[in-house]
Interface confidence: low
């Protein structure tokens, strides 16, 4: 029931997620996590933005679009079969129960041609420490929010518990879109 996106081993995967800022530069915090959107925020955060910038990211996860215009689509570099699964894009609209959550399913297919082996990445680079500045780490791993019914019926594992009547009016065919303001 989740929206499904595909990529081959060794390629970059693209998971679309958009919102429309209320005004230029008036950004909304967004988190991306591995796994369906949980009760609070993004369960296993791989990337996060705040009102100004990308403030937390892990190796291989990038925002290649213009996030300052609301394109918070996630690119995962050089995917492996282990990257398969559900990802949560959560747009953290201020206020109680206002968050918009989107679950996107990534399916990784074996490469048609076996790619040449790449040099192993530095282990520590793959697991940077959680930022310790205020508002990072698990304090933001805990945001309860709404679960919108979007036209592709993205259903989180907590749909029955956190069903909310707010609908995303703007939904691009290419992925999740929400208009703020």
């Amino acid at each position: 029931s989740e929206v499904e996106y595909r990529a081959e081993v060794g390629q970059n995967a693209y998971l679309p997620c958009f919102y429309t800022p209320a005004a230029p530069g008036n950004l909304v915090p967004v988190c991306w996590g591995k796994g369906a959107c949980p009760v609070f925020e993004c369960g296993n955060v791989v990337l996060r933005t705040d009102e100004r910038d990308v403030n937390y990211w892990t190796s291989r996860y990038w925002l290649n679009g213009d996030f300052r215009k609301g394109d918070v689509s996630l690119t995962i570099e050089n995917v492996t079969l282990a990257d398969s699964g559900i990802y949560c894009c959560r747009i953290q609209i201020p206020g109680i129960m206002n968050d918009e959550k989107f679950n996107l399913k990534l399916v990784i297919k074996p490469a048609k041609v076996t790619p040449a082996p790449t040099r192993q990445r530095d282990f520590t680079a793959a697991f940077p420490r959680m930022l310790t500045t205020r508002g990072h780490g698990p304090a933001e791993t805990q945001t309860l929010g709404s679960l919108p019914d979007i036209n592709l019926t993205q259903i989180s594992t907590l749909a029955n518990e956190l069903r909310d009547s707010r609908l995303a009016n703007d939904l691009r065919d290419s992925g999740a879109t929400i208009r703020i303001g």
Epitope: G35, V39, G43, V46, G85, P138, A139, E140, Q142, T143
Partner: antibody, heavy 114, light 112 residues
Amino acid sequence: QIQLVQSGPELKKPGETVKISCKASGYTFTNYGMNWVKQAPGKVLKWMVWINTYTGEPTYADDFKGRFAFSLETSASTAYLQINNLKNEDTATYFCARDAMDYWGQGTSVTVSS
Amino acid sequence: DVVMTQTPLSLPVSLGDQASISCRSSQSLVHSNGNTYLHWYLQKPGQSPKLLIYKVSNRFSGVPDRFSGSGSGTDFTLKISRVEAEDLGVYFCSQNTHVPWTFGGGTKLEIK
């Protein structure tokens, strides 16, 4: 349904090591972080750590750095708490709690006594 | 660390009465993203805590509507409109706005 099942009670002597487990079921283990929380007799609940079960990365409370080790066996959907060089003040019930502390294990009683 | 202070420590009630528990934090629990991460739990004897109310005022799955939460900033209240026997136990508030996450000392709801 979502369940967190913890290992049984432990009676240890000071200086020994204890390792307790928390086995999750009813959801995909690596989709949700895991917490450990300490409840000592007559004391306030104390949050110990939040572990990103996807990356294995822990975020600790300052009081629980050093003698405390937190680990995962993702293939078995299990989280572990190990306490080294046990002290009397480690006597408590230890709870695992899923990601947002929405679901909790039944608790594991650890008694440290000479 | 954020200190969470609950009052009263003990709350004797008659079944059917309304009960009110206060929780105050030593600093504002409004997060920079606008959310307030103040939650309420009930712990019955020999059991683990169960989530009742999340983010100040939202009832968790399966929680009866006689439970309600309110408040803002540093001052929060849990109300039980008509106490039933199954409501007896220790109530905790907790905050997830600031690391380390912290809990209140608990309020024991008991029969008069």
